[in-house]
């Protein structure tokens, strides 16, 4: 790589940063950036609040949250004061007719009669054939099965009560959840009238009952958590300590660890090459060729032809060669990456508070999601409930004259219709009135608000951390020159001056994400379409948008670092960050990959460590522990293990995201430092001695030989 060529490349991406004698790290005297975007964002938030208030005023989430019987009366209120739970006669019809959108808009509504009951059924029961001719009183009332609709005569025939759907044909042991009776016991599936021949439904029901496996399971799970929550917390504490320890120890072991990891990857690739060669050789000797196979969509068939393994071998060999070449020719860059990782470890050690900033982000994200969810729920229930006539089997004798789907009054049920099972059921909410007519637009506004606020919160986190870590890098005398409260001051600074810039970056990302969501929705709708061209175009679009989102995230991240340091607006910061990175593209790629590798290993270490410890502890394989450390007796020991592993992953991700931000910030600062300074007395480098040593540079010593501490 010639120097002249390099200069030309650099100039294509702007001039290197000039020395600025006044620059002392994150600039103190700032002004507000992207004011227009800030105003726009604040107006949007104001609008979002207004939407929330309107939703709150017009909405009635009771309609979704509180159970209502078939007549539209709430359970647990008024005439049903002593009947707080809702029983679905055939809960499986809910499963067959429910999807996420209908639940979001209309609550859990099912095309089956619903009755308020004082307690949920405790035992499995099905109407026996010999009970069809008995009276409702004999079968239901005297057996304490008070689950029929109100007012069904005692001496009515059971079969006619079932035909009119006045009484349930089966009961499943249920537990109240969200005020509704949901099956929870592993019962043998009752022979359900009307659906015995429908295999898919029957299978679905069996599957559902299996998956709702048993009151015992629910109780056992609860017991297990009750017995092991303390130890789960201990496991999470271990995950926290391991994450911290890993990050803090990086300054000591980063070099050897990176080397071991790279060699490990080389080893894995080498084994892959060997394995592919062996498979290829065996198949070649057999003469198994792709020409014999012909075209097939069965991918597993390709495993049995030599060309597949040859192709895999070539790919792995190329990857191995590239990695070896990188190791040989870019070892200097790898050393810089290692030194930066060590530096990042030091920075985190100096500013431990940054490690817990993800909690702030988490809380803010939770607030955004909760606000959106509540607003969406209230909006969805802002219309007047509409009821229509409905019958489970419109082909029944007497139903032909009934106008199904015509509006009706739920308080005036068609009690004695000629059509069996005719009911006045909840259909949805009316779209009369300005709010109701604008409902779709308001929901879209809400979704936009959700994405924008979420992205803004994430941007805030990145910018705050960047500000804190930049103040570490640009402290000439470490730790003396580091501000007292770097995180808090970075937080205040970011909120005060850069809300607009963060909103701008978040908006760009939001628009791309919304486009992706729309594309996913279209793709979902076109699932049935078998047109390969359409599928291909859709795939290309999705791929392009995915790449665009990745790129914008990368650009935004670095723009926020520049904003945190220089306090310039989003566009200038993004341009500066981009050109700076492009001038050092090889370093960027190497650092990025080394960091990814290291953090992946870190996560693996933390999650694996906690997982192994949890496994040995909860499965009682660790012998000789004191009485205080005895593992609890559990029904399902995998439950706390899985909980611990998932918790450990979340914790590790939180910590390592901070560390990743730290590395990126220090890297950008390092590149700036290289371009801005030259090591002379008036332009000393701010980087650590180890980095200077790797680069073969040094700072001139002052005449009085007062060496600055590093």
């Amino acid at each position: 790589m010639g120097g002249k060529q390099r200069d030309k490349d650099d100039e294509a991406y702007g001039k290197p940063v000039k020395y600025d004698p006044s620059f002392r790290g994150p600039i103190k005297n700032r002004s507000c950036t992207d004011v227009i975007c800030c105003v726009l964002f604040l107006l949007f938030i104001l609008g979002y609040i207004v939407v929330g208030i309107v939703a709150w005023l017009y909405g009635d989430p009771r309609q979704v949250l509180y159970p209502r019987n078939s007549t539209g009366a709430y359970c647990g209120m008024g005439e049903n004061k002593d009947k707080p739970y809702l029983l679905y006669f055939n809960i499986f019809s809910c499963i067959l007719s429910t999807n996420i959108i209908s639940v979001a808009e209309n609550g859990l509504q099912c095309p089956t009669p619903q009755v308020c009951v004082s307690s949920c059924p405790e035992d499995p029961w099905t109407v026996g054939k010999n009970q069809f001719s008995q009276t409702v009183g004999e079968v239901f009332y005297t057996k304490n099965r008070n689950f029929c609709l109100p007012g069904v005569p005692w001496n009515m025939m059971v079969i006619t009560s079932l035909q009119q759907e006045l009484c349930p044909s089966f009961l499943l042991p249920s537990a109240p959840a969200l005020g509704r009776c949901f099956p929870w016991t592993n019962v043998t599936l009752p022979e359900l009238p009307g659906i015995t021949n429908d295999t898919t439904i029957a299978q679905g029901i069996s599957g559902l009952i299996d998956s709702l496996n048993a009151r015992d399971i629910s109780v056992k799970i609860f017991e297990d958590f009750a017995h092991s929550w303390y130890w789960i917390l201990v496991a999470l504490g271990v995950a926290l300590l391991l994450s911290l320890l890993f990050i803090l120890l990086l300054r000591l072991v980063a070099g050897p660890l990176v080397l071991v990891l790279i060699l490990g990857v080389l080893g894995v690739l080498a084994y892959g090459i060997y394995y592919c060669w062996e498979e290829y050789r065996v198949l070649r000797d057999k003469g198994a060729s792709i020409s014999q196979l012909g075209f097939t969509t069965n991918l597993s068939a390709y495993q049995s032809v030599q060309e597949t393994w040859l192709a895999a071998l070539i790919v792995l060999a190329v990857l191995e060669a590239i990695l070896l070449l990188v190791l040989i020719f870019l070892r200097q860059r790898i050393r810089i990456a290692i030194a930066l990782l060590k530096e990042a470890s030091k920075a985190v050690g100096q500013m431990m508070s940054t490690m817990f900033y993800p909690l702030v982000t988490f809380v803010l994200l939770l607030i955004c999601i909760a606000y959106w969810a509540m607003t969406a729920l209230y909006l969805a229930t802002s219309g007047q409930p509409q009821y229509v006539l409905w019958a489970s089997n419109i082909s029944s004798p007497g139903c032909e004259k009934v106008s199904i789907n015509t509006s009706c009054n739920p308080m005036d049920q068609p009690v004695n219709s000629s059509c069996p099972g005719l009911m006045c059921v909840f259909q949805g909410y009316s779209s009369k009135g300005l709010v109701q007519r604008s409902l779709f637009n308001l929901q879209i506004y809400g979704v936009l608000g959700l994405f924008w606020t979420l992205n803004w919160v994430l941007a805030l986190g990145q910018c705050v951390l960047a500000g804190a870590f930049a103040s570490f890098y640009w402290a000439f005398h470490k730790p003396q020159d580091i501000p007292t409260f770097p995180l808090i001051s970075a937080f205040i600074r970011t909120l005060r001056y850069h809300t607009g810039s963060l909103a701008f970056g978040a908006l760009i990302l939001t628009l791309v994400q919304i486009a992706r969501v729309i594309l996913e929705y279209i793709d979902h709708k076109l699932r049935g379409v078998q047109n390969p061209v359409a599928r291909c175009i859709m795939c290309c679009f999705k791929c392009c948008l995915w790449c665009l989102e990745k790129f914008i995230k990368f650009l935004n991240r670095n723009a926020y670092i520049m904003i945190a340091i220089y306090g310039k607006n989003f566009c200038v910061s993004a341009k500066n960050a981009f050109t700076l990175l492009m001038r050092n593209i090889v370093r960027v790629v190497v650092l990025d990959k080394v960091t990814d590798l290291l953090l992946f290993f870190g996560k693996l270490l933390v999650v694996g460590g906690v997982g192994v410890l949890s496994f040995f502890f909860f499965s009682g394989r660790i012998q000789g522990l004191g009485r205080d450390f005895k593992s609890p007796h559990l029904n399902y020991y995998w439950l706390p293990i899985m909980t611990s592993i998932m918790g450990a992953y979340v914790i590790a991700s939180g910590f390592f995201s901070v560390f990743g931000m730290c590395v990126d910030t220090l890297f950008l600062c390092f590149l700036e430092d290289l371009e801005r300074n030259d090591g002379s007395l008036d332009r000393p480098y701010y980087m650590s001695k180890s980095l200077l040593k790797i680069l073969g540079k040094k700072n001139e010593a002052p005449p009085d030989n007062k060496k600055r501490k590093k």
Epitope: F132, S133, M157, T160, P193, G398
Partner: antibody, heavy 125, light 107 residues
Framework: QVQLVESGGGVVQPGRSLRLSCAAS????????MHWVRQAPGKGLEWVAV????????YYADSVKGRFTISRDNSKNTLYLQMNSLRAEDTAVYYC??????????????????WGQGTTVTVSS | DIQMTQSPSSLSASVGDRVTITCRAS??????LAWFQQKPGKAPKSLIY???SLHSGVPSKFSGGGSGTDFTLTISSLQPEDFATYYC?????????FGPGTKVDIK
């Protein structure tokens, strides 16, 4: 074809007993519920009793409850009505009728479809 | 018990007339109502079940309607063989009960 033939009617003194039979043919007797319906001279029809296909459930009109017993012998394809403590007001033509509900139609109940020709019971001293 | 009432108790009509008989239940019986035809000295014959469905072999001139408490039997074009007594019966609530009957005779 489906046929129901009643027998056992006659003249009987008040307080005495009588047993009516109904022989069924042309269908699977054991799968159907059966009714007894009576008609007093010059009057309308009055439902008396029902027995379901397996004999498990029996229901009676209030006027005969405790005095009449409906039963069936599926092996003989025969329906019975045992009438005890007969009264003058029990004088009527007694019909047996098949219920259209068989144990196989889960959700449809249609009531009676096929009737016998009837047997006359006269309660007189 | 459910009381069934029929009106009129008797009616005179000519061949070709359209005749409607009404049956009323003392409480709601949904559509569990049957209509029977009985000629003098003969056993009753089932015409209609579920308020409006014809038993097999019953001519389409007979039609039934209604639900709940009020029901009707209509003979669209009266023929000589249709002069008889017509009974309604509810069959959902024990004890099953018949209406008093409507006698249709020749004018």
């Amino acid at each position: 074809q489906v046929q129901l033939v009643e027998s056992g009617g006659g003249v009987v003194q008040p307080g005495r007993s009588l047993r009516l039979s109904c022989a069924a043919s042309g269908f699977t007797f054991s799968s159907y519920g059966m009714h007894w319906v009576r008609q007093a001279p010059g009057k309308g029809l009055e439902w008396v009793a029902v027995i379901w296909y397996d004999g498990s459930n029996k229901y009676y009109a209030d006027s005969v409850k405790g005095r009449f017993t409906i039963s069936r012998d599926n092996s003989k394809n025969t329906l019975y009505l045992q009438m005890n403590s007969l009264r003058a007001e029990d004088t009527a033509v007694y019909y047996c009728a098949r219920d259209r509900y068989s144990g196989y139609d889960y959700y449809y109940y249609y009531g009676m479809d096929v009737w016998g020709q009837g047997t006359t019971v006269t309660v007189s001293s | 018990d459910i009381q069934m009432t029929q009106s009129p108790s008797s009616l005179s009509a000519s061949v070709g007339d359209r005749v409607t008989i009404t049956c009323r239940a003392s409480q709601g019986i949904y559509n569990y109502l049957a209509w029977f035809q009985q000629k003098p000295g003969k056993a009753p014959k089932s015409l209609i079940y579920a308020a409006s469905s014809l038993h097999s072999g019953v001519p389409s001139k007979f039609s039934g309607g209604g639900s709940g408490t009020d029901f009707t039997l209509t003979i669209s074009s009266l023929q000589p063989e249709d002069f008889a007594t017509y009974y309604c019966q509810q069959y959902t609530i024990y004890p099953f009960t018949f209406g008093p009957g409507t006698k249709v005779d020749i004018k």
